[in-house]
């Protein structure tokens, strides 16, 4: 068992051109805080994957207001260390993610707002008990300077925090076969309580008589280096001669993952996928509870009343992510139907509807003809969010209110003359033509093409079109 400690020294603009704008202003004062996430091994995992070694949030830093016209300086930092306790052996190799968050303190609707300023990540080798390691990481135009170390919690000592130390029973020297505990020279290594023969370098135990292996080692006494190349068995390496396991109990048998974690075998041992809110090699640690206020942007923390239960954040509309830290463009979900224009006002979503549609999401197709009378005997025809009138003869326009000139379209063919009439129009046909529109030629022999002229009308007489 032990503690990983992170000390942030500075966060500010990096060297070179393109200095970032200050994240705070007179209108929007803000303060910083940091989050660290640790994972065992040199994993290339996504930022969202579980922090299996643990995670920690810093306190909020001092409030900072930008001085107008001044370049962004190093920003004021929270006091103290970020500490991530680990209960099992320190793995020696680890991956880290350090996030710099901004808390805006202006007149925010619904309280403070949070946004991620920078995220840096790296993979490192580190022995527990060693000195502070210094590091500089850049994220865009920002630069983060920090130091870190892993230290064992008494009585554990060693590079993996797996050896146990006890105060000396005699003032002068340690008991037979026991060495002083460097750097605690006034303490002695505790008598071995692990299984007899358990490798002192590659094995450790938390209970008397057990022998658990550090990463990279296997076998009942942790004396066999892991080698995946020559193994046929899916269980992985074990035998001291071949370096391979004979089929036997798998590392996930009995599910070593606590708190509902799911176990999956890896070439070296096993890996626990923990429920949200739980960390640690066996999902035994909960680094964050609802009391830590992990839900941003108005999110509600559900569950997670104590370190042994996971929390989840229920996010207000417009935010997502495990901590409601990601803003969603709600209009990208195309909530407005029937071609409506989407407006995300922050406090609400609005749709501006096309003509003929209504409702909060333009979901209602209006009855286009409702309340719309067509004048002068016209009939209303619906269509596509608009109405039109089919007008009676002699009328036109959108609502059939305009008296139409029936002769405007030159309806009389072959040079016939058009006369407006109360019931429509009349064509006076030119010689040689007949019909309502003068559309039929009269044959030279006096017989007309169908239809024949009604009795009493000579070809050439005006014919009324009814």
């Amino acid at each position: 068992a032990g503690v990983f400690e992170l000390q942030i020294h500075s966060f500010g603009p990096g060297p070179g051109p393109g200095a970032p704008r200050s994240p705070c202003s007179a209108r929007l004062p803000c303060r910083l805080f940091f989050r660290v996430c640790l994972k065992p091994g040199l994993s290339e995992e996504a930022a969202e994957s579980p922090c299996a070694l643990g995670a920690a949030l810093s306190a909020r830093g001092p409030v900072y207001t930008e001085q107008p016209g001044a370049p962004a300086p190093d920003l004021p930092l929270p006091d103290g260390l970020l500490q991530v306790p680990f209960r099992d052996a320190w793995p020696g190799t680890f991956s880290f993610i350090i996030e710099t968050w901004r808390e805006e303190l202006g007149d925010q609707i619904g309280g403070p707002a949070w946004s991620l300023l920078a995220r840096v990540a790296g993979r490192r080798r580190l022995a527990a008990g060693g000195p502070w390691a210094r590091d500089i990481q850049r994220a865009g135009a920002w630069e983060l300077r920090f130091s870190y170390r892993a230290r064992c919690e008494p009585p554990a000592v060693g590079t993996a925090c797996t050896r146990l130390c006890r105060p000396r029973s005699a003032p002068s020297r340690c008991g037979p076969g026991l060495r002083p505990c460097a750097p605690l020279e006034d303490e002695c290594e505790a008598p071995l309580v692990c299984r007899a023969g358990c490798s002192p370098e590659h094995g450790f135990c938390e209970q008397p008589g057990e022998c658990r292996c550090l990463e990279g080692w296997t076998g009942p006494l942790c004396t066999v280096p892991v080698s995946t190349s020559s193994c046929l068995s899916p269980r992985g390496p074990s035998s001291a001669t071949t370096g391979c396991l004979v089929p036997g109990p798998g590392p996930c048998d009995g599910n070593p993952c606590a708190n509902g974690g799911s176990c999956s075998e890896t070439p070296r041992s096993f890996e626990c996928t923990c429920p949200r809110g739980f960390y640690g090699l066996r999902c035994e640690v909960s680094g964050v509870t609802c009391a830590d206020g992990p839900c941003f942007n108005g999110g509600l923390c559900v569950g997670g009343a104590d370190p042994d239960s996971a929390y989840i954040c229920h996010c207000p509309p417009g935010f997502q992510g495990s901590n409601c830290e990601k803003r969603v463009d709600r209009c990208s979900l195309q909530p407005c139907r029937n071609g409506g224009l989407c407006l995300d006002l922050g406090h609400a979503l609005r749709c501006r509807c096309r003509a003929g549609f209504a409702g909060p999401r333009c979901e209602h197709d209006l009855d286009d003809c409702a309340g719309r009378a067509c004048a002068n005997g016209g009939t209303c025809v619906e269509g596509g969010g608009a109405h039109r009138c089919s007008c009676a003869l002699g009328f036109g326009g959108r609502d059939c209110r305009e008296r139409a000139d029936p002769c405007a379209a030159r309806p009389c063919a072959h040079g016939g003359r058009c006369y407006a009439h109360f019931s429509g129009l009349v064509c006076a046909c030119a010689p040689g033509y007949m019909g309502a529109r003068c559309e039929f030629p009269v044959h030279p022999d006096g017989a007309s093409a169908l239809p024949a002229a009604p009795p009493g009308l000579r070809p050439g007489d005006p014919q009324r079109y009814l």
Partner: antibody, heavy 118, light 108 residues
């Protein structure tokens, strides 16, 4: 602006199930979380639970074993069912919308009194 | 759950006076996720303040909220006749959502 209207029987017999419906107008039911709150006569407010249009729910642990909240987006309604009622469940029941900026209550129905009595 | 305790239970004041209502949480309310409501007899509650200090739309500026952590205050700078009502605080940082027991502001 959101308007909410509770409806349902005003009298329920002990051990039966209380059923109420809230009809939402003025905005889309998919815009907000929707909640039920109750107030026994002469007493304070008690949150019952909420629902999102996606089906996400969260209930007060003190009532969780008896409460079901559901949503019907096509009708712009959400409903409350409270089983095995006793006289202690007599209260004015309010439906309300949960604000976009956090889980507080910005628009309320006028409330409906439900009496549990045989 | 977070228990909210309001004090005093009843506040007797005259119109024009200043009213100070207290809401104390059993544990820290994260990010000042605290709201205040006003309720008049026979009516539904009305949102006054959220985020501990932000006035809701249409709320007069004589109402103000302050506080963080576990101690929150609602102040009515000059009581108007229509302000005599019951006031509730509510936290919305941690589930379950909880209300205070209420403070009744009555005419002296």
């Amino acid at each position: 602006q959101v308007q909410l209207q509770e409806s349902g029987p005003g009298l329920v017999k002990p051990s039966e199930t209380l059923s109420l419906t809230c009809t939402v107008s003025g905005d889309s039911i998919s815009s907000y979380y929707w909640t039920w709150i109750r107030q026994p006569p002469g007493k304070g407010l008690e949150w019952i639970g909420y629902i999102y249009y996606s089906g996400t729910t969260n209930y007060n642990p003190s009532l969780k074993s008896r409460v079901t909240i559901s949503v019907d987006t096509s009708k712009s309604q959400f409903s409350l069912k409270l089983s095995s009622v006793t006289a202690a469940d007599t209260a004015v029941y309010y439906c309300a919308s949960i604000a976009v900026r956090g889980f507080f209550f910005d628009y309320w129905g006028q409330g409906t009194l439900v009496t549990v009595s045989s | 759950e977070i228990v909210l305790t309001q004090s005093p239970g009843t506040l007797s004041l005259s119109p024009g006076e200043r009213a100070t209502l207290s809401c104390r949480a059993s544990q820290s309310v994260s990010s000042s996720y605290l709201a205040w409501y006003q309720q008049k007899p026979g009516q539904a509650p009305r949102l006054l303040i959220y985020g501990a200090s932000t006035r809701a739309t249409g709320i007069p500026d004589r109402f103000s909220g302050s506080g963080s952590g576990t101690d929150f205050t609602l102040t009515i700078s000059r009581l108007e006749p229509e302000d005599f009502a019951v006031y509730y605080c509510q936290q919305y940082g941690t589930s379950p959502l909880t209300f205070g027991g209420g403070t009744k502001v009555e005419i002296k």
